[in-house]
């Protein structure tokens, strides 16, 4: 007859004694301690033993597990070479926002005051202080006489009265090629009119770089135009009292933050900027402090994340907030601010926000980050040499040369980049690792044991509560249902304890004979 | 229009309570710090607490440092500045103003007396 | 904290005056400073913000300068108008705090 041995089969059969699941047991030491023989010296050393060892592992598991929530991260520090690299960004921006000669009379009419060329009454402050030539110039712009005020755009007047990447630029070299003012393209900052090589946004592809070295990168020689700069009588956040370019290395994916990003390089020199990139990979909370970058930015006006276009989003949006106008350089589609709405509000506001409001615009770092380390020298330009060379070439005066002309190289000093990656100190793999690596060396333990001593509670729990009589009925119909042939006093009858106490082997019967027979089928398991 | 309202001030016994309230409207209150500043009769103006725009931070002048409290509740666009163990030198016209790179607008004002 | 000193405390002056009043900051302050026109029994009135600029609706005749620890308010043809009290604020650090005040009077 068979026996049938699916566990719903018999639900008042009584579960195997604790020694005989001792015995059989995974675990060390559980023999040892429910062992046949009657309280000894023995069997308290192994208990306390295992219950010492037990002890330990909750201690050591505890710690592990209360160290895994500590979400610990170290960091990997990298190089790598490559045969070739992504040349940066770069941006640049002359100090001076507006050429003398491009302002005109309207203009001086609507933003004189900004520019602090002009007080509240439309008056020139300070004569002593002017230039000359410069103040006839003036004078004569500044006499509103039966002037008739035209319409003003702030955005038209940086664009036009901006230095021309044309009129600046004396010689472009690109990994030793020629390049022009075409590959530089229009960008708006706090700084007006700037210009970014090497975009990536104007529809020409990245350019790349081969080799590392001077003569594999960027080599532009300027003319900063001090001629062109205005008069400063007063200070205004328009006002510069530097003379210079702005420079700013930046990955494409970001747009230029030049005022505050950005470096100086000065007339009179040949700067040279050795670059190396830096791809910095951080970790999300609660690893880290980094934000998960989706498709989606979160940003207002850009499509993808970076803490300098979060930046510009949040000073857009608190300019907004303030002043109901946006900054030439900022994006959205609010009305331009008027010089007046400049003056009285949004530059105060913007300098409120970047140098006072430590809250409003926290941005927090991406995930994944390029950015590029930086090391300046810097030499004099001309020589006494090649002053009179210059000079004759610009067909400009050699004084002119000295404050005027500068020199630019920016080339990677090797060709490779560094990884800064943070790494989970400790992940779910290590605290299982260390997890099953105490339980082994202190109880001899594995997942499969836990599973046994969960099965063996299961039935002696099933057992007490089918004792009260909740289990009888359906044994019953099962017994009826499914034929089951062998009763537990038939098993009892066979008594089989003593004649295999002394059998350390057990007998062997096939498998799954019997119900709540384990694989290995020793009768001892289940009768006694 | 941008306009802040005060409320909550009256007489009140030294080591008593009292809590000021300022509603805030026409602007995003949550974007902006807010301060309580108090001038007691015939003296100058004195800054008493500020706290910023989310409510994490927040700063009292050491003369009621330890007595009152600053809290916003942003939901409601509404500041507080609730005063305890108070005395007579807190005798004074309450006005909670706007931070920003100019504190505008004020509250009116609210009279406070401490006396028994 | 950092202390504003006020001078003068009080200020006699006629009408059509050219006035100055002068306020010192214990250390740099930027140009965060603002300057207020209080008059009995109302709330202080904003004249100048961040040290030079003129709040809109606040007359011409008002002016502000300095930066760093040294700030002046002048009034270039004094109004009737005009004869209130005048604070100066700095609001560059925790704890804000304001100059003592000058009175601005009828000579």
């Known amino acids: 007859m068979e026996l049938k041995a699916e566990e719903e089969e018999v639900g008042g059969v009584q579960p195997v004694s604790i020694q005989a699941f001792a015995s059989s047991s995974t675990l060390h030491g559980l023999a040892h301690i429910f062992s046949y023989e009657r309280l000894s010296l023995k069997r308290a050393l192994w208990a306390l033993c295992f219950l010492g060892s037990l002890a330990v592992l909750l201690c050591v598991c505890t710690e592990r597990v209360q160290y895994y929530f500590h979400y610990h991260h170290v960091t990997k520090l990298d190089e790598v070479a490559a045969s070739q690299l992504t040349f940066p960004a770069v941006t640049l921006c002359n100090l001076n926002e507006f050429r003398f000669s491009q302002v005109s009379k309207n203009d001086l009419y609507h933003a004189g005051e900004l520019l602090a060329l002009l007080n509240n009454r439309y008056e020139i402050p300070d004569t002593q202080m002017a230039d000359e030539k410069q103040l006839e110039i003036l004078q004569d712009k500044a006499n509103f006489r039966s002037f008739k005020p035209k319409p003003f755009n702030m955005r038209e007047f940086y664009d036009r009265a901006g230095h021309d990447i044309r009129d600046m630029l004396l010689s472009c070299h690109f990994r030793g090629e020629v390049c022009s003012a075409e590959d530089f393209k229009v960008v708006f900052t706090r700084y007006g009119k700037c210009y970014t090589f090497n975009s990536g946004r104007d529809g020409r592809p990245r350019l790349k770089t081969m080799k590392g070295g001077t003569g594999n990168g960027l080599e532009i020689m300027l003319d900063i135009q001090q001629d062109e700069y205005l008069p400063v009588w007063g200070e205004t956040d328009e006002t510069s009292f530097e003379a210079g370019i702005k420079v700013q290395i930046h990955s494409q994916d970001e747009p230029p933050f030049i005022d505050q990003l950005g470096f100086g390089v000065a007339p009179g020199f040949q700067t040279f900027v050795a670059c190396q990139e830096q791809r910095l990979i951080y970790l999300p909370p609660p690893w880290g402090t980094c934000k998960a970058v989706t498709m989606d930015s979160d940003l207002d006006f850009f499509d993808s994340y970076s803490i300098t276009a979060c930046r510009i989003d949040c000073e857009t949006r608190y300019l907004v907030e303030n002043c109901n106008c946006r900054m030439v350089h900022m994006p959205g589609d609010a009305p331009y601010c008027t010089p007046e709405q400049y003056k009285e509000c949004a530059d105060p506001a913007l300098d409120f926000l970047v140098e006072k409001d430590q809250e409003y615009c926290v941005c927090e770092m991406p995930c994944n980050l390029t950015r590029y380390g930086k090391e300046l020298s810097m030499v004099k330009i001309p020589s006494k040499a090649s002053a009179k060379y210059l000079a004759k070439k610009f067909n400009k005066s050699e004084q002119y040369i000295g404050e005027n002309i500068l020199v630019l190289d920016i080339f990677f000093e090797v060709l490779n980049y560094e990884t800064i990656e943070q790494k989970k100190a400790y992940e779910i793999a290590g605290l299982l690792g260390d997890i099953g690596g105490q339980m082994g060396l202190f109880i001899g333990a594995s997942i499969l044991t836990v599973l046994e001593l969960f099965d063996y509670a299961y039935e002696v729990i099933k057992h007490k509560l089918c004792r009260r009589g909740k289990c009888q009925k359906e044994a019953k119909r099962s017994s009826a249902d499914k034929g089951v042939a062998l009763s537990l006093d038939d098993v009892k009858r066979h008594n089989p304890c003593e004649s295999l106490r002394g059998h350390p082997a057990g007998m062997t019967y096939a498998a799954n004979i019997l119900p709540h027979h384990p694989a290995r089928g020793t009768f001892e398991d289940f009768t006694c | 229009e941008v306009q802040l309202l005060a409320s909550g001030g009256g007489l009140v016994q030294p080591g008593g309570s009292l809590r000021l309230s300022c509603a805030a409207s026409g602007f995003t209150f949550s974007s902006f710090a807010m301060s309580w500043v108090r001038q007691a009769p015939g003296k100058g103006l004195e800054w008493v607490s500020g706290?910023?725009?989310?409510?994490?931070?927040?700063y009292y002048a050491d003369s009621v440092k330890g007595r009152f409290t600053i809290s916003r509740d942003n939901s409601k666009n509404t500041l507080y500045l609730q005063m305890n163990s108070l005395r007579a030198e807190d005798t004074a016209a309450y006005y909670c103003?706007?931070?920003?790179?100019?504190?505008?607008?004020w509250g009116q004002g609210i009279r406070v007396t401490v006396s028994s | 904290d950092i202390q504003m000193t006020q001078s003068p405390s009080t200020l006699s002056a006629s009408v059509g005056d050219r006035v100055t009043i002068t306020c010192r900051a214990s250390q740099s302050i930027s140009s965060w400073l603002a300057w207020y026109q209080q008059k009995p029994g109302k709330a202080p009135k904003l004249l100048i913000y961040k040290a030079s600029n003129l709040e809109s609706g606040v007359p011409s005749r008002f002016s502000g300068s300095g930066s760093g620890t040294e700030f002046t308010l002048t009034i270039s043809s004094l109004q009737p108008d005009d004869f209130a009290t005048y604070y100066c604020q700095q609001y560059n650090s925790y704890s804000y705090t304001f100059g003592q005040g000058t009175k601005l009077e009828i000579k």
């Open positions: 103003a706007k931070e920003a790179y100019k504190w505008q607008p």
């Open positions: 706290i910023s725009g989310s409510g994490v931070s927040t």
